[in-house]
């Protein structure tokens, strides 16, 4: 089947401090030497990506230095890290991978990851 | 709004050049990988190439490879396709059409008439 | 390369009528990569379908899609005017990027 299957877990609670992390895995086709992985969320039936990096099979990925990702690679496997989120982000975290090097090239698109995010209570003045 | 509008199309000679450029606006042109899109007078949609991202990635159909040149210019949010030693078989409208988040071609220009 | 080809090539039906378009693949393809497109006389193409069967923004729900393995169809429940059109299905999972040779929905 000329088609590339990612696997994702269905749903990640963050942490308290608006982390959360998943494991993204391809099937791959071929014998990749350049990957690209974007995450997209998808909430309300709108789309927005919200990272993308690309990186030689091997090698670290590198996001933007802005951005609020961060990941390392491991063979067919992208352990991917989302901070900075707040509770208004929970939604659907899709990972979508691209085999852009050497041809042919191939998509593959998650499920995607439900990512809860609750924000934490507001610690109470105490009176002493 | 999502727009592309392709220009440079005309008519030409067998074996002469012609350059196509495709105008994108009203998304981050660089987030995205763009393909040329063909069609025939009559005929059905044949994919022509397409160019990835930051530009260093392209693939072509077997039909125009080693004639055709895709390539970008993100600071100008613009396309091109160099097409070298046309034939009579390359006459069509060329689209240009932004590969999706998901993966179709989810916004297509108006197309360019090359005779 | 993945050859699609659709069935049939002209599909004549009065405005009301349920269309049926079929688009067999050469190989197994994971329908998940598998798109629709209408075209219209002089028009550029436009994306209906994604992924099989998720229609794109904008898309009426009389438009829908399904399938899997080698065989995906494209169904519309009841023709209006604006239909009557040519309509491609397109692999986009794997590089060359393949569409179909057509259907044209033309009315009765």
């Known amino acids: 089947c000329k088609a590339m299957h990612v696997a994702q877990p269905a749903v990640v609670l963050a942490s308290s401090r608006g982390i959360a992390s998943f494991v993204c895995e391809y099937a791959s086709p071929g014998k990749a030497t350049e990957v690209r992985v974007t995450v997209l969320r998808q909430a309300d039936s709108q789309v927005t990506e919200v990272c993308a990096a690309t990186y030689m099979m091997g090698n670290e990925l590198t996001f933007l230095d802005d951005s609020i990702c961060t990941g390392t690679s491991s063979g067919n496997q992208v352990n991917l890290t989302i901070q900075g989120l707040r509770a208004m982000d929970t939604g659907l975290y899709i990972c979508k991978v691209e085999l852009m090097y050497p041809p042919p090239y191939y998509l593959g698109i998650g499920n995607g990851t439900q990512i809860y995010v609750i924000d934490p209570e507001p610690c109470p003045d105490s009176d002493f | 709004q999502v727009q592309l509008v392709e220009s440079g199309g005309g008519v030409v000679q067998p074996g002469r050049s012609l350059r196509l450029s495709c105008a994108a606006s009203?998304?981050?042109?660089?987030?995205?990988?763009i393909h040329w899109v063909r069609q025939a007078p009559g005929k059905g949609l044949e994919w022509v190439a397409v160019i990835w991202y930051d530009g260093r990635n392209k693939y072509y159909a077997d039909s125009v490879k080693g004639r055709f040149t895709i390539s970008r210019d993100n600071s100008k949010n613009t396309l091109y396709l160099q097409m070298n030693s046309l034939r009579a078989e390359d006459t069509a409208v060329y689209y240009c059409?932004?590969?999706?988040?998901?993966?179709?071609?989810?916004?297509w220009g108006q197309g360019t008439l090359v005779t | 390369e993945i050859v699609l080809t659709q069935s049939p090539g002209t599909l004549s039906l009065s405005p009301g009528e349920r269309a049926t378009l079929s688009c067999r693949a050469s190989q197994s393809v994971s329908s998940s990569y598998l798109a629709w497109y209408q075209q219209k006389p002089g028009q550029a193409p436009r994306l209906l379908i994604y992924?099989?069967?998720s229609r794109a923004t904008g898309i009426p729900d009389r438009f829908s899609g399904s399938g899997s393995g080698t065989d995906c169809t494209l169904a519309i429940s009841r023709l209006e005017p604006e239909d009557f059109a040519v309509y491609y299905c397109q692999q986009y999972g794997s590089s060359p990027w393949t569409f179909g040779q057509g259907t044209k929905v033309e009315i009765k």
């Open positions: 059409a932004r590969g999706g988040n998901w993966g179709p071609f989810d916004y």
């Open positions: 992924g099989a069967s």
């Open positions: 009203g998304f981050t042109f660089s987030s995205y990988g």
